[in-house]
């Protein structure tokens, strides 16, 4: 019997793009690839696997805004940026099954227009394969 | 014989917390979880596996300090911050079996009080499973 | 039949060093280890596996320069730094088979001397083992 070296099961990861954010709401996220191993639902990224995640957030905004990235009600944000016109940040956070990663945005202008985003990208990459997952 | 897709052995990773640092010494680190795949010994994180590590360091300090994170005697620090009251940094470093990750702290006040830390967190995540490990 | 836990195949990763950059060209990169799972060819790091990569870039330069890190003709840079004397950045990017990671450098001095680099280091670590690779 020939031994075949084991292949890695696919790592949970996703890249979503966003070109528009709504004031006092969030950013409209879309996943450009059908091959992602994580899913978007109701404008949130669904976490199925417990563990550390590498998180990358980038974007240039059409006007100054305050932006937070949340993962669980009643918990502090993963990222929080106050009165910025761009973001290029990397972080590590422990997320768990049932968490949902979503944006909250507020602009400081009197107009309630949507905010346009150039190069808006959010990447999540699971760092602990082998841990608990629920699908 | 039914083929079961291989599971990942657990990745070497750890999150330690610290709420207190001693002037001209280090920070008192504790691991809040019993499930960590890496261990703390003599206030240092023990490295068993060779490879790149993703390192995240966060904290707010009760007074201005200079803080370094070391891994091996006679080598430069993984992080070095001078005269700060907070840290929120991410880095990548190559560590090897027998390395120990530990803090060194100096305050610039004349008093020799302990420094209290809020939200003090150090995360290490091994990036090269499959490489050499010694337990 | 005794079950042996599967070993991880080695992760695609590399650390290259650079001590010299040529104006209007790139930086001369060398891989200090023979055990790297990725290769350097024509001053570029060759990408064999599709997926996200964690990228760390560090260095102190002998004079002010503008530096970009590219991966594909006609695409924007992975990093772009204007008029800096040092870099210490981390990023995440999606790279694919046939991509090549290389530097472009411009100095703003009238002299066309090489730029000396202290602590010049570029690390790439594949984040999606189990995905497509071509060797």
């Amino acid at each position: 019997l020939q031994q075949v070296p084991p292949q890695y099961p696919p790592i949970q990861s996703i890249r979503v793009q966003f070109t528009r954010c709504e004031n006092e709401k969030g950013c409209i996220i879309t996943s450009p690839s059908k091959d992602e191993t994580m899913k978007v639902q109701d404008n949130s990224i669904i976490i199925n696997c417990d563990g550390f995640y590498l998180i990358s957030l980038k974007g240039y905004f059409s006007e100054e805004l305050s932006l937070s990235l949340y993962y669980r009600k009643g918990r502090g944000p993963l990222f929080s940026l106050s009165k910025v016109t761009s973001v290029d940040s990397i972080g590590v956070a422990y997320l768990a099954f049932k968490d949902k990663v979503y944006f909250n945005v507020t602009t400081h202008s009197t107009s309630y227009k949507d905010i346009q985003v150039n190069g808006g990208e959010l990447i999540l990459i699971h760092q602990n394969p082998g841990g608990f997952c629920a699908y | 014989l039914q083929q079961v897709p291989p599971q990942y052995p657990p990745i070497q990773s750890i999150r330690v917390q610290f709420t207190r640092c001693e002037n001209e010494k280090g920070c008192i680190i504790t691991s809040p979880s019993k499930d960590e795949t890496m261990k703390v010994q003599d206030n240092s994180i023990i490295i068993n596996c060779d490879g790149f590590y993703l390192i995240s360091l966060k904290g707010y300090f009760s007074e201005e300090l200079s803080l370094s994170l070391y891994y091996r005697k006679g080598r430069g620090p993984l992080f070095s911050l001078s005269k700060v009251t907070s840290v929120d940094s991410i880095g990548v470093a190559y560590l090897a079996f027998k390395d120990k990750v530990y803090f060194n702290v100096t305050t610039h006040s004349t008093s020799y009080k302990d420094i209290q830390v809020n939200g003090g967190e150090l995360i290490l995540i091994h990036q090269n499973p499959g490489g050499f490990c010694a337990y | 039949l005794q079950q042996v836990p599967p070993q991880y195949p080695p992760i695609q990763s590399i650390r290259v060093q650079f001590t010299r950059c040529e104006n209007e060209k790139g930086c001369i990169i060398t891989s200090p280890s023979k055990d790297e799972t990725m290769k350097v060819q024509d001053n570029s790091i060759i990408i064999n596996c599709d997926g996200f990569y964690l990228i760390s870039l560090k260095g102190y330069f002998s004079e002010e320069l503008s530096l970009s890190l590219y991966y594909r003709k006609g695409r924007g840079p992975l990093f772009s730094l204007s008029k800096v004397t040092s870099v210490d950045s981390i990023g995440v990017a999606y790279l694919a088979f046939k991509d090549k990671v290389y530097f472009n450098v411009t100095t703003h001095s009238t002299s066309y001397k090489d730029i000396q680099v202290n602590g010049g280091e570029l690390i790439l670590i594949h984040q999606n083992p189990g995905g497509f690779c071509a060797y």
């Epitope: 305050s66 502090g76 | 709420t19 907070s86 008093s111 809020n118 939200g119 | -």
Partner: antibody, heavy 118, light 107 residues
């Protein structure tokens, strides 16, 4: 000029709930650690809860743990205190306080009065 | 938990020196903060980390701490200094502890 303005204080029955708000202006809200401190009538100051600038660390006084929740909305420059299962001994003026270094309270609001009585 | 003890009241003659103490087990090993609260007003930070004055606080206010006692000294007390004074530390669980407060009367 730095201003912290609390609101939401009211008369409430024992066992009831209230949510206090504190709107910050004149500071970079995301750089400041925020606390609630209360003062019962004729009594001294009593710290209630802290949330650090990044939101990564929250601590509560033992007497309110499990009943009160501190949170912050960076977009709205607002600190909150959700108070559930209120008791007569929670009657106090509630101050919002901020610190650039988390150990001291640089700025204070003028307070909002909470009365718990049947 | 850490307990801070203050005298309920202290009196001082106008332009004389007032000393307000704050007792606690090895308080000298902790950073001590002092707040002034005038009648009907919010507290104000007057001393941080034992002996440092924030911008705008008059030089007559000073602080010291060692052993089991921290002391706030007002050199040349003025009528406007009549107020309640609170000491504060953080315990090892990052919880803020206030003393019971001392009312300073300026005669």
């Amino acid at each position: 000029e730095v201003q912290l303005v609390e609101s939401g204080g009211d008369l409430v029955r024992p066992g009831g709930s209230l949510r206090l708000s504190c709107v910050a202006s004149g500071i970079t809200f995301s750089s400041y650690h925020m606390s609630w401190v209360r003062q019962a009538p004729g009594k001294g100051l009593q710290w209630v809860a802290l949330i650090n600038s990044g939101g990564s660390s929250i601590t509560y006084a033992d007497v309110v743990r499990g009943r009160f929740t501190i949170s912050r909305d960076y977009a709205k420059n607002t600190l909150y205190l959700q108070m559930n299962s209120l008791r007569a001994e929670d009657t106090a003026v509630y101050y919002c306080a901020s610190g650039s270094i988390w150990t001291h309270f640089d700025y204070w609001g003028q307070g909002t009065r909470v009365t718990v009585s049947s | 938990s850490f307990v801070l003890t203050q005298l309920p009241s202290v009196s001082v003659t106008l332009r004389q020196t007032a000393r307000i103490t704050c007792g606690g087990d090895i308080i000298g090993s902790k950073n001590v903060y002092w707040y002034q609260q005038r009648l009907g007003q919010a507290p104000v930070l007057i001393i941080y980390r034992d002996s440092n004055r924030p911008t705008g606080i008059p030089e007559r206010f000073s602080g010291a701490s060692s052993g089991n006692t921290a002391t706030l000294t007002i050199s040349g007390a003025l009528a406007e200094d009549e107020a309640d004074y609170y000491c504060q530390v953080w315990d090892n669980s990052n919880k803020a502890m206030f003393g019971g407060g001392t009312h300073l009367t300026v005669l």
